[in-house]
Interface confidence: medium
């Protein structure tokens, strides 16, 4: 059956931790992505932002995991209203911001 939301979120957090704590050089060669609003539809928005980064094996697992949280198919170039379209940040900062937000959600028991 499907993985319980709390387990899936924990696994996503663990993967984001592995990425952020393991940097010896700028993540994805310092690639820039659109910032997002960390609100209700953030999983799809995060995937829409990160899917535009190609050739970066470090975030491929994260992209796959985020797709499991997003109910619709996401492809490169697709954007939702959740993006702050005038702000681009480095992938490393994007991933860390996402990690810190998800940690708070997990601690508060907001698994979905």
């Amino acid at each position: 059956g499907p993985v319980p939301p709390s387990t899936a979120l924990r696994e996503l957090i663990e993967e984001l931790v592995n990425i952020t704590q393991n940097q010896k050089a700028p993540l994805c060669n310092g690639s820039m992505v659109w910032s997002i609003n960390l609100t209700a539809g953030m999983y799809c928005a995060a995937l829409e932002s990160l899917i535009n980064v190609s050739g970066c094996s470090a975030i491929e697992k994260t992209q796959r995991m985020l797709s499991g949280f997003c109910p619709h198919k996401v492809s490169a170039g697709q954007f939702s209203s959740l993006h702050v379209r005038d702000t681009k940040i480095e992938v490393a900062q994007f991933v860390k911001d996402l990690l810190l937000h998800l940690k708070k959600l997990f601690r508060e028991g907001q698994f979905n």
């Epitope: 663990e14 931790v17 952020t20 704590q21 997990f106």
Partner: antibody, heavy 122, light 108 residues
């Protein structure tokens, strides 16, 4: 209230062994990762070892690898540190500390014991 | 293994702002925690995850982290803030915890 109490410290000769214990109370011990951290007199903090909430994984600082063993008994709410082949440079106050376990690494130490002094001297 | 560099000492007058730095390669990507240790006492967590504060810690304590430097800021410093302060991260390459060397905060 939540508490960690270390015991087992003392004076020991180089090459000898010592076993430290840390008794936990006031919280659900089995859900927390646990660590040992030491502090030599007048020096800074040095991480020694950690053990996952269920005892399934353990990690050690290079300086103690092969000599120290960390264990826990969740039924008794106790953390242990078996220290063998002790050296003068192991002289320090040894603290046990807990870390929220829910994603295993990079968590802060939110509760510390008061420490137990270990002196290695001939 | 990963190295964290802190200034040995920082001095500040009461009521002023103290800033204690913690340097490390790309530390901005890591989660940094800060501890306060007073003489003869165990360390106490004052800031975690770069900038979050445990419930019993005053709002005067704050943290930031970007690039190669994390900073603990103590505003409106009081005599009771005099202590050693340590930064801490997790080092994935060694699967272990790393502490900075510590900074002694002196309140003039």
């Amino acid at each position: 209230q939540m508490q960690l109490v270390e015991s087992g410290g003392g004076v020991v000769q180089p090459g000898r062994s010592l076993r430290l214990s840390c008794a936990a109370s006031g919280f659900t011990f089995r859900t927390y990762g646990m660590h040992w951290v030491r502090q030599a007199p007048g020096k800074g903090l040095e991480w020694v070892a950690d053990i996952w909430y269920d005892g399934s994984n353990k990690h050690y600082a290079d300086s103690v690898k092969g000599r120290f063993t960390i264990t826990r008994d969740n039924s008794k709410n106790t953390l242990n540190l078996q220290m063998n082949s002790l050296r003068a440079e192991d002289t320090a106050v040894y603290y046990c500390a807990r870390a929220p376990q829910w994603y295993l690494v990079a968590e802060p130490f939110d509760l510390w014991g008061q420490g137990t002094m270990v002196t290695v001297s001939s | 293994s990963y190295v964290l560099t802190q200034p040995p000492s920082v001095s500040v007058a009461p009521g002023q702002t103290a800033r204690i730095t913690c340097g490390g390669n790309l530390i901005g990507s890591k989660l940094v925690h800060w501890y306060q240790q007073k003489p003869g006492q165990a360390p106490v967590l004052v800031v975690y995850d770069d900038s979050d504060r445990p419930s019993l810690i005053p709002e005067r304590f704050s943290g930031s982290n970007s690039g190669n430097t994390a900073t603990l800021t103590i505003s409106r410093v009081e005599a009771g803030d005099e202590a050693d302060y340590y930064c801490q991260v997790w080092d994935s390459s060694s699967d272990g915890v790393v502490f900075g060397g510590g900074t002694k905060l002196t309140v003039l």
